[in-house]
């Protein structure tokens, strides 16, 4: 009996048209739903002239429905039993499940000024920049509305600069109609434990954006991982969120829905510093921000996004050192609402429900030649919003899953 | 003091790509944009476009949109300039030009890399 | 593309004399930030150009106080008070406020 249902997983959870697992894997049949709170800065005018710590409090959530469009230009290639596509990104706002409106203003860092500075490090260029970010009234801390944070606006320091540069600034700009990948991932048909794992991004097998095995692409999307999955795994994915491959571990059994799945959590070793996690040596990119690679918990990914500085870490720095948090006020970190899970159902590898949670930082440092910098006595990595993404399987789909699957099992 | 290093010229096929170095010296490379000029024989000057090598970002004429891929190696301070689908017209001196800090000037040159396409 | 139109082409002058160059572009050259991008360039036979002028009247570091940058909008002339045997070459005035940038077609200043 055991082998006969071994042999149905088998079948059905490669990626290839007919098996139950393609259908989900082109188009997720599961609502998935991204909810950002932002740092609405309180102190603004303290921050800049007096390098006070800057006070911040959450609001939200705002919450869009993303992960609603079809995988495009899926192609299977039979030689080397892979599978490639590209996946389109897309967000729809949901007033019913928001606090306010896309129209919201929240008083935030100036992303271009923070990104320009640190970018052009020259000190004759900064004294040009300075100019412009004058004469365009532009300050160290703007006010901007929901639409215009998270998806783009036109800056007006930046349409002053004489160079052809993007004068459109955004956290997620630009997505609508843009796509991530291409993804190349192995469809299982030649060896089921591979299913789903990626084997190429972007048409490389590394990312050139770290040293050594950090810049490798491991593991899957976290959307499903090969089947039977074991308690003692530790589940290897990549997150182009976050510009790296990361790795969750088993946490507790859950019932969802009746369906019994395995909790994978990431554990905070993943965000610990090289003092005690020697692993992540190479996710420390430079020595002054991060204290000679003693500080944890915030990842810069500014190489993967043109030198902007970006930081990423969990919401409310949970897992990071009290050094980076300590300039900042009125943050309340706790696991339960700010880490990230997968719930996965063993027998299948599927992933039925997750939490994905992430927060957008930051740095803004010093600047002799930036009026609006000069103050500042210290370096802050500004935390600028946090999202929650989540999906669970519905409970039409967990009723067939239940007979299909487990049903069949138990 | 600041110097700009160009390669060797080029004699070459229509159709065929080149990649012409400008190695630089003398200043910190990845802190000022690193433009590439054309003259055509006897003739003025053309913008091509242009790289910052602190992150690689680029600016174009669109005019040499597809003709040319502007890229830099960091370690080596060397910014290199690569022309594709060579014709006769892509004949001319190429300049690679420092710029002079973000006032769209160019204060240093390179000696220039003679290209002649020719079957 | 912003054009730019140098004149004369050719400037034939004595040694010690005054020369003039004009440079005139198809629309302002004032840049929304409140600039002017127009620089001049001198390339002698076989060499690379070397800035002279930036920014309409800016001298770029070791030129001669006999050359003189002015001019605004659409109209800029470069002056040399004396001219002397090593500023013989081309010149050409360039345009940084509208991207593609561009450069005029150059005045060849020679000796009469």
């Known amino acids: 009996g055991d082998l006969l249902i071994q042999k149905t997983i088998k079948k059905q959870v490669v990626l290839e048209e007919g098996t139950i697992a393609f259908k989900n894997w082109v188009k997720t049949g599961t609502e998935v739903y991204r909810q950002f709170w932002i740092f609405d800065v309180q102190n603004p005018q303290e921050v800049m002239m007096n390098s006070s710590n800057i006070q911040v409090k959450q609001r939200g959530p705002y919450t869009y429905r993303v992960r609603f469009l079809a995988k495009e230009n899926v192609t299977q290639d039979a030689e080397d039993n892979t599978v490639s596509f590209l996946q389109p990104n897309g967000a729809i706002f949901e007033p019913s499940l928001s606090v306010g409106t896309e129209a919201d203003n929240f008083t935030v860092l100036n992303l271009a000024v923070a990104a320009a500075s640190h970018i052009y490090q020259n000190q004759f260029v900064q004294m040009i920049l300075n100019s412009l970010i004058n004469k365009s009234k532009s300050s160290m801390f703007q006010v901007r509305t929901l639409r215009e944070l998270l998806w783009g606006y036109r800056d007006p320091f930046l349409s002053l600069v004489p160079y052809p540069v993007t004068t459109t600034v955004g956290l997620f700009y630009p997505y609508n109609n843009t796509a991530d990948g291409v993804y190349k991932v192995f469809n299982g048909k030649d060896n089921i434990s591979k299913v789903a794992i990626i084997d190429t991004y972007k048409g490389k097998r590394n990312l050139s954006y770290w040293e050594s095995h950090c810049d490798m692409i491991n593991g899957t999307d976290a959307a499903s991982f090969p089947p039977f999955v074991e308690k003692s795994q530790v589940l290897q994915f990549f997150s182009s969120d976050i510009c790296r491959s990361i790795y969750a571990v088993f946490e507790s059994d859950v019932n969802l829905k009746g369906i019994p799945v395995y909790r994978f959590v990431l554990p905070s070793k993943a965000f610990a510093s090289p003092v005690e996690n020697p692993d992540n040596y190479c996710f420390c990119t430079e020595k002054i921000i991060s204290k000679n690679c003693t500080s944890y918990g915030v990842l810069d990914i500014s190489k993967c996004k043109e030198g902007r500085p970006v930081y990423i870490s969990l919401p409310h720095f949970l897992y990071a050192s009290p050094d980076v948090s300590e300039p900042i006020d009125g943050l309340n970190p706790n696991e339960e609402e700010h880490r990230t899970y997968l719930d996965i159902e063993p027998i299948t590898g599927f992933t039925l429900q997750f939490a994905k949670r992430l927060q957008v930082n930051l740095l803004v440092k010093p600047s002799e030649k930036i009026q609006v910098l000069k103050n500042l006595k210290r370096n802050y990595i500004v935390p600028i919003l946090w999202l929650n993404e989540t999906g669970t399987i519905g409970d039409e789909k967990a009723n067939m899953f239940r007979s299909q699957v487990t049903g069949k099992i138990n | 003091d600041v110097q700009l290093q160009e390669s060797g010229p080029e004699l070459v096929k229509p159709g065929a790509s080149v990649k012409i170095s400008c190695k630089a010296s003398g200043y910190t490379f990845t802190d000022y944009n690193m433009h590439w000029v054309k003259q055509s024989h006897g003739k003025s000057l053309e913008w091509i476009g242009y790289i910052y090598p602190y992150n690689g970002g680029t600016g174009y004429n669109q005019k040499f949109k597809s003709k040319a891929t502007l890229t830099v190696d960091n370690s080596s301070s060397t910014a290199y300039m690569e022309l594709r689908s060579l014709t006769s017209e892509d004949s001319a001196v190429y300049y690679c030009a420092r710029d002079g800090g973000y006032d769209v000037y160019f204060d240093y040159w390179g000696q220039g890399t003679t290209l002649t396409v020719s079957s | 593309d912003v054009v730019m139109t140098q004149t004369p082409l050719s400037l034939p002058v004595s040694l010690g004399d005054q020369a003039s160059i004009s440079c005139r572009s198809s629309q302002s050259l004032v840049h929304s930030n409140g600039n002017t991008y127009l620089h001049w360039y001198l390339q002698k036979p076989g060499q690379s150009p070397k800035l002279l002028i930036y920014k309409v009247s800016n001298r770029f570091s070791g030129v001669p106080d006999r050359f003189s940058g002015s001019g605004s909008g659409t109209d800029f002339t470069l002056k040399i008070s004396r001219v002397e045997a090593e500023d013989l070459g081309v010149y050409y005035c360039?345009?940084?406020?509208?991207?593609?940038?561009?450069f005029g077609g150059g005045t060849k200043l020679e000796i009469k």
């Open positions: 360039f345009q940084g406020s509208h991207v593609p940038w561009t």
